[in-house]
Each structure stands twice: as structure tokens, then as C-alpha cells.
């Protein structure tokens, strides 16, 4: 079953590497668990970033040693990517899973390009 | 494409029983989704009466108290509603639906109306 | 339960008109509202859900917004086969309710 997926056409990351945008699905009722990962398209190559499980009314849990945090409210999933560098630039898709009850819905994002500056080195000073 | 079809009586006594059944057709009903009943009262009024999952798990609408019984015949593709001690206030159309869980309905049955009256 | 108000019962409207109906909730429902078009002798369509997502094969005329408590369906450019009668549906939360309705008429 297909869902609308909602996100930020574009997004520029802060002078620290971090990026945040909103993930909404268009929720057909209250799936009790929903599956939200983040695939980053570059150069026609896509490769998940991170993924996370989570029950309805819980924190969404990455791994550990995950780049990304985020939070859920209601069918809204609040993203952030930390640790970004200007090479990471590129198009992050919100993929959105309603894992349980069934049936299964997907919903693919159109993505959101964050652009990624490095910071200038700060001079030298005497 | 799904499809839900009631039948059943059109016509009650008060203090007696009604039973109506929902037909669905074009997804097996132990696939997914909730299967629900709706009755709307002359004046266009709507009330949810209750469910039965996919899993066979049940919940019903608590001003309805223990009237109603929701069940299913898996084989038939079919569920049903048994109504207790209905009176005058029972005088609707119902119609069955379906949604996902804690959700909007996206398939109804066309209604059948029910008359309570001795 | 959660009582969703339709405060008007009828709306009177011209072909060509925009017009607003609304539904307020007596509690927080976030976006979990849904609306329906209703005409005599049919079953209720769905038309939005998730607040203002619209159903499949649904005209763009139809358009739905608010969150929390307030609701509004606003249909543009109203065509006469639009006059019927506007459920909006909370489900949030169980026992699943419904406002009483908002019929649209021909002025």
C-alpha cells in the first residue's frame, strides 16, 4: 500500500555539520510500529544513512553509533544528521514503513537536498 | 477492487435481537485492516458501534455496554453484528467499513435499514 | 468520548462559490480527522484524511486544514454535485466519532 510522504525540498546544514528537517506520513490511522530510514542519493547511488523502529508514542532508537537522532509526534518524525561534511552534500529521502498492524504501507519521500559548507580554518593568530 | 455488502432483517421487535451480516469481497478480511460497524439515525446522525481486526480482537463503542457482539465466519469472508434488547433507538441504517487501525474509513458497504417496532 | 461539532447544519452556497465548513473537536486530536460527502440514499465517501490529505481520485477543489481542535474542508469552485452533506470524523482516539453534519445547499 502506498502513503504520501512529506519533507523539505532543500535544507542547508549548520557551521557544525548538522542538518534537521520534518518527515510527515500521510497516515492512514495509528500504525502501533513504524519503521523511518533516511537514504542519501548521490551520483545515481542510494545507501542508507541510518533506520530506526519505533512504537507509536515512543523515542525513535538509532543505533548507537548512528549519525542520525530524531523525534515522533503523531505521523511527524523529526530528523537530524549530525557529523555532515560538504562532501555529504546530496538528496536525503524519508522512507517511512507502517510495519504493524497490517497491512503493510511504504512511503518514499521526494527527498531533501542539504547542502553541507565546510567552515573556513580560522586564521592563525599572533 | 473491496467491496461490503449488509443484509439482514429490516424489521425488529423491541426487546428482541438483530443480526446483520457484512460481506466483503476483494480482501480476505484475516489479511488486515479492522472491520467495523457504523449505523447512521434518521437525522443523519453517525455512531461507531464497534470492531473486529484482522486477528479476530474486538472493541466496541462502551455506550453500547454488552448489546453487541461483532464476529466473523473466516471461510465466508463474511462478519456480522448481533445487537441485544434493541427498542425504538435502534432504528437506523447501518452500514459496515473498513479502516486501518484507529483509522478513517476508505471502504463502506451501501447500508441497510433497520426498523425497531412491534 | 470526544464530541466533534459541526456548529452549522446548513450552508447555503452558489456554483462557482468557495465555501469553508468546520469542525471543532472538544479535546486534542493532532491531524487524525477525516471528512465525508454524503448524498440521500448513499453511503458516506471519504474525501480527507490525515487532515488534509485528499482521498484517491478526489477533485483538488477539496482541500482540508487545521490541527489540534480546529478543522475547517473548504471546496472551491463549488459544482452542483458537490451539494450533499459533510461529516468530519476524529480518530484519534476510541470510541471513533463523527460531527452531526453540515448540508450544503443551493443558495
Known amino acids: 500500500k502506498a502513503m504520501h510522504v512529506a519533507q523539505p525540498a532543500v535544507v542547508l546544514a549548520s557551521s557544525r555539520g548538522i542538518a534537521s528537517f520534518v518527515c510527515e506520513y500521510a497516515s492512514p490511522g495509528k500504525a502501533t510500529e513504524v519503521r523511518v530510514t533516511v537514504l542519501r542519493q548521490a551520483d545515481s547511488q542510494v545507501t542508507e544513512v541510518c533506520a530506526a523502529t519505533y512504537m507509536m508514542g515512543n523515542e525513535l532508537t538509532f543505533l548507537d553509533d548512528s549519525i542520525c537522532t530524531g523525534t515522533s509526534s503523531g505521523n511527524q518524525v523529526n530528523l537530524t544528521i549530525q557529523g555532515l561534511r560538504a562532501m555529504d552534500t546530496g538528496l536525503y529521502i524519508c522512507k517511512v514503513e507502517l510495519m504493524y498492524p497490517p497491512p503493510y504501507y511504504l512511503g518514499i519521500g521526494n527527498g531533501t537536498q542539504i547542502y553541507v559548507i565546510d567552515p573556513e580554518p580560522c586564521p592563525d593568530s599572533d | 477492487d473491496v467491496q461490503l455488502q449488509e443484509s439482514g432483517q429490516g424489521l425488529v421487535k423491541p426487546s428482541q435481537s438483530l443480526s446483520l451480516t457484512c460481506s466483503v469481497t476483494g480482501y480476505s478480511i484475516t489479511s488486515g485492516y479492522y472491520w467495523n460497524w457504523i449505523r447512521q439515525f434518521p437525522g443523519n446522525k453517525l455512531e461507531w458501534l464497534g470492531y473486529i481486526g484482522y486477528d479476530g480482537s474486538n472493541y466496541y463503542n462502551p455506550s453500547l455496554k454488552n448489546r453487541i457482539s461483532i464476529t466473523r465466519d473466516t471461510s465466508k469472508n463474511q462478519f456480522f453484528l448481533k445487537l441485544n434488547s434493541v427498542t425504538s433507538e435502534d432504528t437506523a441504517t447501518y452500514f459496515c467499513a473498513r479502516n486501518y487501525y484507529s483509522g478513517y474509513f476508505d471502504f463502506w458497504g451501501q447500508g441497510t435499514t433497520l426498523t425497531v417496532s412491534s | 468520548d470526544i464530541v466533534m461539532t459541526q456548529s452549522q447544519k446548513f450552508m447555503s452556497t452558489s456554483v462557482g462559490d468557495s465555501v469553508s465548513v468546520t469542525c471543532k473537536a472538544s479535546?486534542?486530536?493532532?491531524?487524525?480527522v477525516a471528512w465525508y460527502q454524503q448524498k440521500p440514499g448513499q453511503s458516506p465517501k471519504p474525501l480527507i484524511y490525515s487532515t488534509s490529505y485528499r482521498y484517491s481520485g478526489v477533485p483538488d477543489r477539496f482541500t482540508g486544514s487545521g490541527s489540534g481542535t480546529d478543522f475547517t474542508l473548504t471546496i472551491s469552485n463549488v459544482q452542483s454535485e458537490d451539494l450533499a452533506e459533510y461529516f468530519c470524523?476524529?480518530?484519534?482516539?476510541?470510541?471513533?466519532?463523527f460531527g452531526a453534519g453540515t448540508k450544503l445547499e443551493l443558495k
Open positions: 470524523h476524529q480518530y484519534d482516539t476510541y470510541p471513533l466519532t
Open positions: 479535546q486534542n486530536v493532532g491531524t487524525y
